[in-house]
């Protein structure tokens, strides 16, 4: 025998108190699948949370975080405080990045500036708390008399010595 409740669609529940009739989910509740014997209470996006998507009879509400915070975890289970660019969140709140580090986002940690010399390059633009350094050509390319952009050497045919 087929379970009569299996005929109840999403947005309804199988009401045992009414001979297993499919009843609509009450206000502020939902059922996302058919054949449910109860409806789930809608999530309420209050306090640090705000509503991104309203609850319907077939789907739960979705929350995000109020301005000044960003979501953490699946379904925005928690909110973390934003900081400004050039800062990171510490135990004592938002603090400026230390010299030699930067953060170009409102979240995350300060990261060290790129060390241009490791790639044999020079610093073209200095780093700030908000921005990484910009590496330029290698120091040898910037020696006196050398143009800042070295043109490619002309191709030589084999067996010809340079002039």
């Amino acid at each position: 025998l087929q379970d009569p409740c299996s005929n109840c669609p999403a947005g309804t529940f199988c009401d045992n108190n009414r001979n297993q009739i499919c009843s609509p989910c009450p206000p502020n509740s939902f059922s996302s699948a058919g054949g449910q014997r109860t409806c789930d209470i809608c999530r309420q996006c209050k306090g640090v949370f705000r509503t991104r998507k309203e609850c319907s009879s077939t789907s739960n509400a979705e929350c995000d975080c109020t301005p000044g915070f960003h979501c953490l975890g699946a379904g925005c289970s928690m909110c973390e405080q934003d900081c400004k660019q050039g800062q990171e969140l510490t135990k004592k709140g938002c603090k400026d990045c230390c010299f030699g580090t930067f953060n170009d986002q409102k979240r995350g940690i300060c990261r060290p500036w790129t060390n241009c010399s490791l790639d044999g390059k020079s610093v073209l633009v200095n780093g700030t708390k908000e921005r990484d350094v910009v590496c330029g050509p290698s120091p040898a390319d910037l020696s006196p008399g050398a143009s800042s952009v070295t043109p490619p050497a002309p191709a030589r045919e084999p067996g010809h010595s340079p002039q």
């Epitope: 309420q44 306090g47 640090v48 975890g73 289970s77 928690m78 973390e80 405080q81 969140l89 004592k92």
Partner: nanobody, 128 residues
């Protein structure tokens, strides 16, 4: 056994100050996000403030922003709520709550279902 014990409530005149404390035991305090929730007579619960396990993230309801300050001392397993410029509408029972999850060291929640443990509450009455 987990315990949250609030103290510091009492009767204060409008404009006055109080400092609530919540002493925690029976769990790893620094891993838990904490919150202060109040309930006035005949009204629903209101999340007043919350703080992450590390203390870095704090949240305040608009109704208390600029007047209340939440803090925690993880070495003493204690949560605090400094309440200044108190108003008659701050009269309520204040509860502390503790909840943990993957992000509870850095994040906060104002969803009551997130919180695993609740204290018994302390009464704050603001009246002249």
């Amino acid at each position: 056994e987990v315990q949250l014990v609030e103290s510091g409530g009492g009767l204060v005149q409008p404009g006055g100050s109080l400092r609530l404390s919540c002493a925690a035991s029976g769990f790893t305090f620094s891993s838990y996000a904490m919150g202060w929730v109040r309930q006035a007579p005949g009204k629903g619960r209101e999340f007043v403030s919350a703080i992450s396990g590390s203390g870095g993230t704090t949240y305040y309801a608009d109704s208390v922003k600029g007047r209340f300050t939440i803090s925690r001392d993880n070495s003493k397993n204690t949560l605090y709520l400094q309440m200044n410029s108190l108003r008659a509408e701050d009269t309520a029972v204040y509860y502390c709550a503790a909840g943990t999850g993957y992000y509870s060291r850095v994040g906060v929640s104002t969803d009551p279902s997130f919180y695993d443990y609740w204290g018994q509450g302390t009464q704050v009455t603001v009246s002249s």
